[in-house]
Amino acid sequence: KESCDVQLYIKRQSEHSILAGDPFELECPVKYCANRPHVTWCKLNGTTCVKLEDRQTSWKEEKNISFFILHFEPVLPNDNGSYRCSANFQSNLIESHSTTLYVTDVKSASERPSKDEMASRPWLLY
């Protein structure tokens, strides 16, 4: 019998390399059985996760899973950082793993760091 708990499918230590100025959608895949839970996004500031109140979000429904999407239109340099989605379900708060966005500032194409270079930045290691 399949569990009817809400599950948030963000992989542990997931990372995305994105360009400032581009649009980007950060997805929180949500599995639920009956009623869709209330889901929010927050951004980590040290050990505190600050709720993102005034940001554009939307739902995308698929057959077996739904996606709660945080929209970046466009991505800004200060969007760099770690994010987490949370769901309220039967008075329980379920938190996802955090996912990290590495924002590359817009430069000429020849100066843009590759994904591999992004992964080498020591200040991004942890």
């Epitope: 499918y9 963000i10 992989k11 542990r12 230590q13 997931s14 995305h16 793993h97 992964a119 942890y126």
Partner: antibody
Amino acid sequence: QVQLVQSGAEVKKPGSSVKVSCKASGVNIKDTYMYWVRQAPGQGLEWIGRIDPANGYARYAQKFQGRATITADESTSTAYMELSSLRSEDTAVYYCAVYDGYYESFDVWGQGTLVTVSS
Amino acid sequence: DIVMTQSPDSLAVSLGERATINCKSSQSLLDSDGKTYLNWLQQKPGQSPKRLIYLVSKLDSGVPDRFSGSGSGTDFTLTISSVQAEDLAVYYCWQGTLFPRTFGQGTKLEIK
């Protein structure tokens, strides 16, 4: 069950490159991380790096940064590790492995690929 | 990088006896999610490594219950309660908390 099959042994000249493949079955690789570890003859294990097949983001140990390139092809459930500027010290068995990205509930290793670097 | 140090480097145990392998990390492996990502691998001669234990003490499916893991923070232990002939192998601890992932140097288990 989850299985990994790696490409066959390679003999390479110093200064050249090698590309090892690793094909997964029994799992949707989007839900995993795939990583590479090497083992020199009679030595211990050394982590090279890992990739998130869902978005292609790869991360490397500092020692291999700029020399190793890990990629993944979701359509064929295959990960690749290319190592350039080979030297004799790169002679080793190269293992790929895959683990569950959400709960780490499984971690499966390939059979290994022996890469010999010799002039 | 986190340094993982195992002791002893090798261990000779009689069949049916208990074997204990220690692993020490240079910093805490407790992650921000409250979990500790410490794994134990077994590598039998001529074979690929195989994960035995994850999250300090959880046994992988199919692993005999004579294997157990314990510890917290920086100090961890793999115990084989009653060594069998098929346990002849090198055992590695490794951490999955921070990048880069790092391994202990390995402990060779021999049968007396």
